[in-house]
């Protein structure tokens, strides 16, 4: 077991195109040992993007994150701004990963598990699906995250998460700003630990949500520019380790994909994935229920499924 | 075809609240968002804010945080928004409209509903 | 706050004319601007995103264009029905900002 603080573990080879700030939540520099110095933006539907720190609209909207946290923190909210070992923050289940970004997860000895992270609205408004998460997690920023509608028609369903060591990640998240719940649209790259939540400020006037429906495929997402075309990426199966390709998604406005490659490593599970405690407590799903992700295979290209050992992970789709 | 139906026009109080309505048809309502936006008499347009319908969580502009609440019914279709302690200066065109996933931009309105405050 | 500053606020033009209509933003809104039509008592309607991404039903005589603090629409050839009042939106960052309106009369 070895922590590689200075190892690179967030690699990026494509840069996505823009993204407008008001999708984004936070920002991670990777590490000087990956060479392509790259920001890592995570979107309010916790997906991970490479982007370019030389482009302005990069630079423009790291200031306004960085603003947006400094508000916060003289309001008297929460955000993080991790120093030094810094877990992922979502998981490949719970969002799409830019196929320019490797995220090398390195076994650390602890069990610690990679949190499907409920890709609110942001996700959906993606591509309109998320994991399905039981109501009222919370996220690392003490807010209450609102629990996210099923995938939509024709996705793969009733995909379970599994739990891997944490990635340990030596970037920095330099700005965090009020999570905003909330649909967007781009190629990623994901994360474990809990994600932050909706902005605090909303909770009050969240709606009660009934059971969740399914939605269809392609609705509420558009096109922003030349991009790539969806490559439905259904079959879950994959060689037990390696990296695992997460496709370019849907966002076709997003550029030539900039999702994730996530190397995981699947661990023994007890049948109840862990949450590690987060900033306003912990939450354990019941034993009995298994959390299930529910996505469309357009928006997610890595799809994880929760594994008893490392041979099932071809197994159990 | 996409439709957005909002409720009738309302003559409020000032101090009073007001609950405008507004029911989706033609596509997935958990799918996109729900904006607000009001138009005040001869005026530009302003932004309130958002609710995702698939997962309830709203978004606001700060101008009108602490006295509006935006919520969603899934299972009829019907968005709301709830604004409180009314004033004059509240007399406006209320609008939903439908924000895509992919940015918020609105690419159908609701045929608005006129909410007049006065004493 | 993104201030949006349309001009001008109104023209006056005829048929077959090429209409020109300005929005400027107070901060880079990296293209991230809708324009609208409106027609008295009506709700806006959608006409490009995008910066120039014409929206579902919208004539190509409208087009968009611009980039940084300075966006244009063109309406290439003004048709009866385009006389209307147009605004701009940013949805680069919240709190979502609109310009003024320009309103388009019949000259």
């Known amino acids: 077991q070895h922590h590689g603080v200075t190892k690179c573990n967030i690699t990026c080879s494509k840069m996505t195109s823009k993204i407008p700030v008001a999708l984004l939540i936070h920002y991670q520099q990777n590490q000087a040992s990956c060479g392509k110095r790259a920001i890592i933006l995570e979107t309010r539907q916790h997906r991970l993007f490479c982007a370019d720190p030389k482009e302005q609209w990069v630079k423009d909207a790291m200031q306004h994150l960085d603003r947006q946290a400094a508000a916060l923190t003289r309001n008297g909210g929460t955000f993080e701004k991790q120093i030094g070992e810094v877990k992922p923050r979502t998981t490949p289940a719970a969002g799409g990963m830019d196929e320019s970004v490797v995220l090398e997860p390195e076994a650390t000895g602890e069990s610690s598990s990679l949190e499907p992270t409920p890709s609110s609205q942001e996700a959906q408004r993606a591509l309109g699906t998320s994991p399905e998460l039981p109501t009222g997690v919370t996220g690392s920023s003490g807010t209450r995250l609102p629990p996210t509608p099923k995938a939509q028609d024709g996705g793969p369903v009733g995909t379970e998460l599994f739990r891997v060591p944490p990635v340990s990640t030596a970037a920095t998240w330099q700005s965090s700003a009020p999570h905003q719940p909330g649909p967007s649209l781009w190629a990623e790259a994901k994360t474990s630990e809990a994600p932050s939540t909706q902005d605090p400020s909303t909770q009050a006037s969240t709606a009660s949500s009934p059971a969740p429906e399914e939605n269809a495929p392609s609705e509420g997402q558009r096109v922003w520019g030349q991009g790539q075309s969806p490559r439905p990426e259904n079959s879950l199966e994959r060689e037990e380790m390696g990296p695992v390709p997460a496709h370019t998604d849907a966002f076709q406005d997003w550029g030539p994909g900039s999702m994730a490659h996530v190397s995981v490593v699947p661990v023994s599970s007890e049948g109840t994935p862990s949450r590690e405690p987060v900033a306003s407590g912990s939450w354990t799903p019941k034993a009995e229920e298994p959390i299930h992700a529910t996505m469309d295979p357009q928006r997610l290209g890595v799809l994880i499924t929760p594994v008893p050992d490392a041979q099932a992970a071809t197994r159990r789709q | 075809q996409v439709q957005l139906v909002q409720s009738g026009a309302e003559v409020k109080k000032p101090g009073a609240s007001v609950k405008v309505s507004c029911k989706a048809s033609?596509?997935?309502?958990?799918?996109?968002?729900i904006h607000w936006v009001r138009q005040a008499p001869g005026q530009g347009l302003e932004w309130i804010g958002w609710i995702y319908p698939g997962d309830g969580s709203p978004k606001f502009n700060e101008r009108f945080k602490g006295r509006t609440t935006l919520t969603a019914d899934k299972s009829t279709s019907t968005a709301y928004m709830e604004l409180s302690s009314l004033r004059s200066e509240d007399t406006a065109v209320y609008f939903c409209?439908?924000?895509?996933?992919?940015?918020?931009?609105?690419?159908?309105w609701g045929q608005g509903t006129t909410v007049t405050v006065s004493s | 706050d993104i201030q949006m500053t349309q001009s001008p606020s109104s023209l006056s033009a005829s048929v077959g004319d090429r209409v020109t209509i300005t929005c400027r933003a107070s901060?880079?809104?990296?293209?991230?601007l809708a324009w609208y039509q409106q027609k008295p008592g009506k709700a806006p309607k959608l006409l490009i995103y995008n910066e120039k991404t014409l929206a579902d039903g919208v004539p190509s005589r409208f087009s968009g264009s611009g980039s940084g603090t300075q966006y244009t629409l063109t309406i290439s050839s003004l048709q009866p029905e385009d006389f209307a009042t147009y605004f701009c939106?940013?949805?680069?960052?919240?709190?979502?900002?609109f310009g003024g309106g320009t309103k388009v009369e019949i000259k």
């Open positions: 901060g880079n809104i990296h293209n991230f």
């Open positions: 409209a439908r924000g895509p996933t992919d940015g918020d931009y609105f690419d159908y």
């Open positions: 033609g596509y997935t309502f958990t799918n996109y968002y």
């Open positions: 939106q940013q949805f680069w960052s919240t709190p979502y900002t």
